[in-house]
Interface confidence: medium
């Protein structure tokens, strides 16, 4: 066993190449120096080492940097991202959005796994908030990010960042973080003209209030039955017969299809039978 | 502090009609966000919702009950009443009174009458 | 109509546990679930609405998540007071339905 602690003669390693693949664990761990890895880490994805082999290499950083590796480091960890804990992963100051990217990139295709959900943290943090450029690269990957975010979290995203949500980032949204959405996609598209505004303010309307929808209304949007589904009731009633009419265009024949949904049901409760006659839908109060 | 009251017979003979009233008190029946329900529970057995009124007379029934429901308010009395006809032995349970409140749950409960359907 | 499923129907658990139960909704209901508390002789007693926000004066160890069909009411450490029975209820489309209940027990 003693022996076995000493790099056999010949085998010291003076790269990371190919050959290591061929190393025993214990070899490794005897062979390969710590600060080689740490200048050579950008070669370790391109060579087929085994899980065991990649705990290895790992034990040896992490001997080496116990206080948590240097972005340079983490930079070019590849595969050995899969390895990390969150507990290590909280040691680490990340800063660059290539850093980010790259890392995210090992775990493309799979759920937020813990450790890339600590990563994310780490990042925003040390950022201060969710600028652009780091919201655009996050849902790019993860669309479902924005909706993982409490409404406390969300508060810190800055208006001009809403530009790079999509539709598809706030599918899982719920009322409460569409509520701190919505004015800052307000304040964030306030200069566009009324049809290009409604497109992209449509995704975040589950979080406009009764007097936005007033206004809406009075600009010929059309607005879908999926989108007035998902408005917020106390928002949609106080609306008039002839306000949801305007605002829904020609989409307000789905009303009655969804008369027994919310926020229809509540509303149309709330409306005068003459009034609700006009539509000719048969909806009754 | 809106607090609901129910109140009716505790026994009714089979084919006869259920009627139940709940007042309401520290609020008012004709508030602009609020819907009031009947909800019932058959003895050791779960939750089952009859149906509900707005201040203006709206109502919306269980359709497995509705041919024999009437729910009707009278804001006068700062009350609302439930009449279930042609009552079985099936309709044996304790009746709540409900407020759906604007967050769309029943945040207020009355404490509940139980009702035998038995001759 | 709307079919809410819960799960377990009963368990066992020790002061201190967590304790987790789901529903499921036979149909996407959004964020419209709302749960419930039930004590023996008692009317319920409303916990969490809109899946998952808070209903005022109920303790922060009961929480909810879920969107769309599936849904998760944890209690995050049961204390003697929270053996009970509990619902879910959906208020997106009538009629409103219940689940079947979930009775939590002593072990």
């Known amino acids: 066993e003693v022996e076995k602690t000493a790099c056999p003669s010949g085998k010291k390693a003076r790269e990371i190449d190919e050959s290591l693949i061929f190393y025993k664990k214990w070899e490794l761990e005897a062979c390969v120096d710590a600060a080689l890895l740490a200048t050579q880490m950008d070669r370790v994805n391109a060579i087929p080492f085994t899980y065991e082999q990649l705990d290895v290499l790992k034990h040896k950083l992490d001997e080496l940097y116990p206080q948590g590796y240097p972005e340079s480091v983490i930079q070019h960890l590849g595969y050995l991202f899969l390895k990390m804990s969150p507990e290590d992963i909280r040691k680490w100051n990340v800063t660059s959005l290539e850093t980010l990217k790259a890392l995210l990139e090992v775990n493309k295709g799979h759920e937020m796994s813990p450790q890339v959900a600590t990563l994310i943290d780490r990042f925003v943090k040390g950022r201060g908030q969710l600028d652009k450029d780091t919201l655009d690269t996050l849902t790019a990957f993860y669309p479902g990010y924005l909706c993982s975010l409490s409404p406390e979290e969300l508060s810190s995203v800055p208006p001009s960042s809403i530009w790079a949500v999509r539709p598809q980032d706030l599918d899982t949204c719920d009322p409460r973080q569409l509520d701190v959405l919505y004015p800052k996609a307000r304040l964030a598209f306030q200069n566009m003209n009324g049809s290009e505004y409604f497109v992209k303010i449509q995704s975040f309307l589950g979080g406009a209030p009764t007097e936005d929808l007033k206004a809406l209304s009075q600009q010929n949007v059309s607005m879908d039955l999926a989108t007035f589904m998902k408005l917020r009731t106390d928002a949609v009633l106080p609306l008039t017969v002839a306000e949801v009419q305007k605002l829904l265009g020609p989409h307000v024949e789905g009303l009655k299809a969804e008369e027994r949904h919310r926020p229809v049901r509540d509303w149309i409760l709330r409306q005068r039978q003459d009034d609700l006659d006009t539509l000719g839908l048969g909806l009754q109060g | 502090q809106v607090q609901l009251q129910e109140s009716g017979p505790g026994l009714v003979k089979p084919s006869e009609t259920l009627s139940l009233t709940c007042t309401v008190s520290g609020g008012s029946v004709s508030s602009y966000h609020d819907l009031w329900s009947w909800i019932r529970q058959p003895p050791g057995k779960g939750l089952e919702w009859i149906g509900y009124i707005y201040y203006s007379g709206s109502t919306n029934y269980n359709p497995s009950l509705k041919s024999r429901v009437t729910i009707s308010v009278d804001t006068s009395k700062n009350q609302f009443s439930l009449k279930l006809s042609s009552v079985t032995a099936a309709d044996t349970a304790v009746y709540y009174c409900?407020?759906?409140?604007?967050?769309?749950?029943?945040?207020?409960w009355g404490q509940g009458t139980m009702v035998t359907v038995s001759s | 109509d709307i079919q809410m499923t819960q799960s377990p129907s009963s368990l066992s658990a020790s002061v201190g546990d967590r304790v987790t139960i789901t529903c499921r909704a036979s149909q996407s209901i959004s964020s419209y679930l709302n749960w419930y508390q039930q004590k023996p002789g008692k009317a319920p007693k409303l916990l969490i609405y809109a899946a998952s926000s808070l209903q005022s004066g109920v303790p922060s160890r009961f929480s909810g998540s879920g969107s769309g069909t599936d849904f998760t009411l944890t209690i995050s450490s049961l204390q003697p007071e929270d053996f009970a029975t509990y619902y879910c209820?959906?208020?997106?489309?009538?009629?409103?339905?219940f689940g079947g209940g979930t009775k939590v027990e002593i072990k």
């Open positions: 409900a407020r759906e409140g604007k967050n769309g749950a029943f945040d207020i």
């Open positions: 209820q959906q208020s997106y489309s009538t009629p409103l339905t």
